[in-house]
């Protein structure tokens, strides 16, 4: 849903959320293009691209939250993700530089679609929270009480280290979206029931 417009239909909304999380756990949409663009597509370098522990809530943590807490945690985490993705975008090569070095412009376009897609997911998370009468959550187009700050990597001037940090973050992000998808898959057919 765009611009904060919300569906009142639970099953439709849940279906959208499941579809969005399915797409977002797909590494071919974000991590793989990032690895290619940043020249990390070498076995030795790929080994260094591991998820940083604690960067994202675990599936176990998410499952233990209950619907309300889960949606609030997801909303806050997606806020952090938007910042990290914007930060990564700032340091990507420009389109003309990619063309000069023979890299695929489509990879850059995939990376630049990530933030709007996260925004769309976050809007649906807000809508689902409204549907479940969770009035604590900030409306997507209004400022919140402050985005909870992530365990941000110490800013580094080392370009290679920055690339690896980006890679680790994206690996964690895809894993997190996989966990989110699994939690949503357990939600029941109505707002009031949950399959166990």
């Amino acid at each position: 849903a765009a611009m904060g417009s919300c569906s009142k239909e639970y099953r439709m909304l849940l279906g959208q959320l499941q579809k969005q999380t399915d797409l977002m756990q797909d590494t071919s949409r974000l991590l793989d293009p990032y690895i290619r663009i940043q020249g990390l597509d070498i076995p030795k370098l790929r080994e260094h691209c591991r998820e940083s522990p604690g960067a994202f809530p675990s599936e176990e943590t998410l499952r233990g939250l209950g619907r309300r807490g889960f949606l609030q945690t997801l909303n806050a985490t997606l806020g952090r993700v938007l910042h990290r993705l914007a930060d990564l975008e700032q340091h990507l090569p420009k389109a003309q530089d990619l063309e000069r070095s023979g890299l695929n412009i489509e990879d850059l376009e995939k990376l630049q679609m990530a933030r709007p897609n996260v925004l769309g997911l976050r809007n649906n998370v807000y809508c689902m929270a409204q549907l479940l009468d969770n009035s604590d959550m900030t409306e997507p187009t209004k400022a919140g009480r402050g985005t909870p700050q992530p365990p941000t990597p110490t800013p580094t001037s080392d370009v290679f280290q920055r690339k690896l940090e980006g890679c680790s973050f994206l690996r964690g992000y895809h894993r997190f979206m996989h966990s989110v998808g699994r939690v949503f898959s357990k939600w029941g057919e109505s707002p009031n029931r949950s399959r166990r």
Epitope: R115, P116, L119, T141, A143, R145, T152
Partner: antibody
Framework: EVQLVESGGGLVQPGGSLRLSCAAS????????MSWVRQAPGKGLEWVAT????????YYLDNVRGRFTISRDNAKNSLYLQMNSLRAEDTAVYYC??????????????WGRGTLVTVSS | DIVMTQSPDSLAVSLGERATINCRAS??????????MHWYQQKPGQPPKVLIY???NLESGVPDRFSGSGSGTDFTLTISSLQAEDVAVYYC?????????FGGGTKVEIK
């Protein structure tokens, strides 16, 4: 009343430094990302830098990155712009602006009246 | 960087007549159903003031003679019935990616 008041502008020589401040009042400062936007005399508007609500993330215009540093002190409801290695082309009125809307896709809904920075020998 | 091209550079319109300002982006500033385009008004000696956000949403307190439309690369600000107080320079702004960039401005005057 929601208000932003800039200070710290003035005349500085090329290569010199200046620190701009923006005092915010009338709203929960720590809940908003904040930006600096500049306007050269008789010219259009140019976004310069943005800082996230908690201060962990910063975004810069390419030709100021490495020379300018945006920062904030939420306890003091203040935004700053440290400008080093100033050039003649940095001459402009610098506006402090509040960011609203979708995270990282903001627009600016409240602006200060601006402070003039003149870089000249 | 996304380049925003505004047209015309200046516009003279009679009181009560319609004024139309266009803004074209060098690449799409829309994605996933969102239009990341905003419109500002700036009067001499004053800071800019937001009129329209996300292409078509009227900012609170702005008269409804102002409206915005468009998606992708082409956007329009319309003043349905120009008033004396609308004399100003109008700017478009995209926030699709960093750096955010403004259009060059359109000066609106009374004919």
């Amino acid at each position: 009343e929601v208000q932003l008041v800039e200070s710290g502008g003035g005349l500085v020589q090329p290569g010199g430094s200046l620190r701009l401040s923006c005092a915010a009042s009338g709203f929960t400062f720590s809940s908003y990302a904040m930006s600096w936007v500049r306007q050269a005399p008789g010219k259009g508007l140019e976004w310069v830098a943005t800082i996230s609500d908690g201060g962990s993330f910063t975004y810069y215009l390419d030709n100021v990155r490495g020379r300018f540093t945006i920062s904030r002190d939420n306890a003091k409801n203040s935004l700053y712009l440290q400008m080093n290695s100033l050039r003649a082309e940095d001459t402009a009125v610098y506006y402090c602006a509040r960011d609203v809307g979708h995270t990282t896709f903001w627009y600016f809904d409240v602006w200060g009246r601006g402070t003039l920075v003149t870089v000249s020998s | 960087d996304i380049v925003m091209t505004q047209s015309p550079d200046s516009l003279a319109v009679s009181l009560g007549e319609r004024a139309t300002i266009n803004c074209r982006a060098s690449k799409s500033v829309s994605a996933a159903g969102y239009n990341f385009m905003h419109w500002y008004q700036q009067k001499p000696g004053q800071p800019p003031k937001v009129l329209i956000y996300y292409a078509s949403n009227l900012e609170s307190g702005v008269p409804d003679r102002f409206s915005g439309s468009g998606s992708g690369t082409d956007f329009t600000l319309t003043i349905s019935s120009l008033q004396a107080e609308d004399v100003a320079v109008y700017y478009c702004l995209h926030s699709r990616e960093f750096p955010f960039t403004f259009g060059g401005g359109t000066k609106v005057e009374i004919k």
